[in-house]
Amino acid sequence: QPEQKASNLIGTYRHVDRATGQVLTCDKCPAGTYVSEHCTNTSLRVCSSCPVGTFTRHENGIEKCHDCSQPCPWPMIEKLPCAALTDRECTCPPGMFQSNATCAPHTVCPVGWGVRKKGTETEDVRCKQCARGTFSDVPSSVMKCKAYTDCLSQNLVVIKPGTKETDNVCGTLPSFSSSTSPSPGTAIFPRPEHMETHEVPSSTYVPKGMNSTESNSSASVRPKVLSSIQEGTVPDNTSSARGKEDVNKTLPNLQVVNHQQGPHHRHILKLLPSMEATGGEKSSTPIKGPKRGHPRQNLHKHFDINEH
């Protein structure tokens, strides 16, 4: 053998010549092919392309390509097709994740909850309750909690403070004469701006992907009290109505602005596709379909001493 060795030098395998009993060192065949004729002491090995429905992933010294896995079982879809270089790989479609060898839909975070961690093809969505100053007004498996609309930046005032489930409602001040117009820092409301109302309908539930804290453990029961209590704000089931009354008494001429249709609204709903896994906490091993009647489907799948 020549002394020179290069990192990309083709590999070799050993083969016993049946005619002579000689142990020969032959060049491996490239990925996507197999050895159709072994080398002899006068001729190089011969490689042939893998027939349709078979593959070899690496350079090899094997006499037959591996059978591809069977077609993906519903509802899985093909991530990689069966080709000369690759086995068929199955994955869950967008919006679903691998669960017990099938696909389950991503958890939908209910109103008042947002996506903490996007779902992937191998992991479910993780939900979290919307923190102070944020809200989620639609059930979604892709939307994060959105920040309240900043009324002041639009030269508006907060008429109805946002909750975990609703945005701030902004409005305009009545026309004041120059002598009575409020100064920029003047408080307009008798109640704090981030007043939170916790009107949780009895139907509200916490799906398996939800967390009441930032930990990775998934809550499987409804939280005792929504996180505002943990944040130190006592829920007040009457505050919403009373607040509205107070506002209306104090500022009878306020105009309510439907900012969700106005040009300044920044909470436009966008449905985002589920992100593909780039190797997460769960197994990122590609899912294979069952093999076609080959006993080697079990442990050392496709292992061959002559294919590395």
């Epitope: 020549p2 002394e3 020179q4 290069a6 060049d27 004729e37 080398c39 006068t42 011969v46």
Partner: antibody, heavy 117, light 110 residues
């Protein structure tokens, strides 16, 4: 002594055909792959085609694929090259060479093929 | 198949050494230690001088040696003699039973 003797070259018009032969002697022909190499006048060597010992597999340079066919008759110790649809650029000396594993260890003296109208 | 790259000419005085390079790619020279060198005198058939990078067939003087680094092979002729004046061709196996030749180097003994 290993000997390879090519024959069958000559003058042919564009689009015409020729069949080259290479008679092998002085060694056991059947275990060796065989190869045709050509050399245009004043130019370098160009690999043309190879065939495995059994004759069951053949390979061709892109420049001749679909027009040339390599074959062998192990009982006659002879290698062939059937050349169809000849072009001016096929004009060359054609050598047959014994292929010992990866290298051409013995060459014939060559036969000249001229494609011209 | 693109040919390997050789310098068109090389020269040296009798007794000197000269090295001819042959550059290919990772698909041919870089992938296999199957580099051969041929000597061809005008009007003659090529003669094998080196095979498998650095092996000499019987009958070839040990003044001829070969080497390879990455994608480049080299032929060195030391102690140049007048009869060494010829064309030299490198060739590399390129996989799939295909071979690629260099364009040839004309070696002149001054």
């Amino acid at each position: 002594e290993v000997q390879l003797l090519e024959s069958g070259g000559g003058l042919v018009q564009p689009g015409g055909s020729l069949r080259l032969s290479c008679a092998a002697s002085g060694f056991t022909f059947s275990p060796y792959s065989m190869t045709w190499v050509r050399q245009a006048p004043g130019k370098g060597l160009e690999w043309v085609s190879s065939i495995v010992p059994s004759g069951g597999k053949t390979w061709y340079a892109d420049s001749v694929k679909g027009r040339f066919t390599i074959s062998r008759d192990n009982s006659k110790n002879t290698l062939y090259l059937q050349m169809n649809s000849l072009r001016a650029e096929d004009t060359a000396v054609y050598y047959c060479a014994r292929t010992n594993l990866s290298y051409f260890d013995y060459w014939g003296q060559g036969t000249l093929v001229t494609v011209s109208s | 198949q693109s040919e390997l790259t050789q310098p068109p000419s090389a020269s040296g005085s009798p007794g000197q050494s000269v090295t001819i390079s042959c550059t290919g790619t990772s698909n041919d020279v870089g992938s296999y230690n199957y580099i051969s060198w041929f000597q061809q005198h005008p009007g003659k058939a090529p003669k094998l001088m080196i095979y498998e990078v650095n092996k000499r067939p019987s009958g070839v003087p040990d003044r001829f040696s070969g080497s390879k680094s990455d994608n480049t092979a080299s032929l060195t002729v030391s102690g140049l003699q007048a009869e060494d004046e010829a064309d030299y061709y490198c060739t590399s196996y390129a996989g799939s039973h295909k071979w690629v030749f260099g364009g040839g180097t004309k070696l002149t003994v001054l």
